[in-house]
């Protein structure tokens, strides 16, 4: 089942998904002045079984004399099905490496992809926020988001974290970066009165990047 | 596929400096960090530097601070890493590795971890001579 909604955003924080479940698509989007080959993949699909998972298909952009304007659509799963498997894999991939069961990791880039990754997110995704440089975080309670079921509809959980513009003494001390954990927190989740409020998408951006403009999709 | 490739690696006596260089052909830049990691041998793969291809912003480790400088050239889709003073503790593989920035073309120091790079070169040696 696919995320209605992209995660929230919080104000002066920036969130990854550290690992994407299996059912994930990747749009193949190609930046300008380029487009996807003509008999290239529209997206990458997260699949695999229960030792192994990795993305099929693989994005391929061309250069083109006009700009791709293709509208990119979620595909069906009977499309899914009929496309060709290419396990996406980086060289010199540390051994350390942690992988997680039925996730698939960051797609490596592929030559001339657009800036903004857009990903279709499946139930049971979870997202981790930082606050941004210059910002420090206050928790109330985990900093991440589940993109959960409820009563039929989909809905991202609310990251408790707020980032406050009081300067840390030493540059983000003690963080690490989050392991990704196929389940979310549990939550108690016995009410459905759920209002679009709940996950509403905040606009405001941090200070160190108003100069810039960006989608809601996830880059 | 995409690949990273370094050089500028060399002997340099300790005091001299070097300029490492990544070259990322293809790369769409303002969608991730790059940046550089390096290990000597029989330590764990560290993190040095990384610049951030959308805004520009940078980090060090506190190992290299104001001796290494980390630059750009988008439009030759290059990162290079200005390397002065060094000692023999900087001898080691200098590795360039790319990792995609988070939502809002952010990304914050304690991501850039070896095990969690989305691509990474073959690396350049880089030894120092006391």
């Known amino acids: 089942e696919l995320c209605d909604d992209d995660p929230p955003e919080i104000p002066h924080a920036t969130f990854k998904a550290m690992a994407y479940k299996e059912g994930t698509m990747l749009n193949c989007e190609c930046k300008r002045g380029f487009r996807r080959i003509k008999s290239g993949s529209l997206y990458m699909l997260c699949t695999g079984n229960s030792s192994h998972s990795s993305w099929d298909n693989q994005c391929q952009c061309t250069s083109s004399a006009t700009r791709n304007t293709t509208k990119q659509v979620t595909p069906q799963p009977e499309e899914q099905k009929e496309r060709k498997t290419t396990e996406m894999q980086s060289p010199m991939q540390p051994v350390d490496q942690a992988s997680l069961p039925g996730h698939c990791r960051e797609p490596p880039p592929w030559e001339n992809e657009a800036t903004e990754r857009i990903y279709h997110f499946v139930v049971g995704q979870m997202v981790y926020y930082q606050c941004v440089q210059g910002y420090r975080a206050l928790h109330r309670g985990p900093a991440e988001s589940v993109c959960k079921m409820t009563h039929g509809k989909t809905r991202w959980t609310q990251p408790q974290l707020i980032c406050t513009g009081e300067m840390e003494t030493s540059q983000f001390p003690g963080e690490e970066k989050p392991q990704a954990s196929p389940e979310g927190r549990p939550e108690s989740e016995t009410s459905c009165l759920v209002t679009t409020t709940d996950f509403q998408i905040q606009t405001e951006m941090a200070a160190t990047m108003e100069t810039s403009i960006f989608t809601t999709e996830y880059q | 596929q995409l690949q990273l490739v370094e050089s500028g690696g060399g002997l340099v006596q300790a005091g001299g400096s070097l300029r490492l260089s990544c070259a990322a052909s293809g790369l769409t830049f303002d969608g991730y960090a790059i940046g550089w990691f390096r290990q000597a041998s029989g330590k764990e793969r560290e993190g040095v530097s990384y610049?951030?291809?959308?805004?520009?912003?940078?980090f060090y480790a506190d190992s290299v601070k104001g001796r290494f400088i980390i630059s750009s050239d988008n439009a030759k889709n290059t990162v290079d890493l200005q390397m002065n003073s060094l000692n023999p503790d900087d001898a080691a593989v200098y590795y360039c590795?790319?990792?995609?920035?988070?939502?809002?073309?952010?990304?914050?120091?304690?991501?850039?971890?070896?095990?969690?790079?989305?691509?990474w070169g073959k690396g350049t040696l880089v030894t120092v001579s006391s």
């Open positions: 610049i951030n291809g959308r805004d520009g912003s940078t």
């Open positions: 590795a790319v990792d995609r920035l988070g939502s809002r073309g952010a990304y914050v120091s304690s991501w850039w971890r070896s095990p969690d790079m989305d691509l």
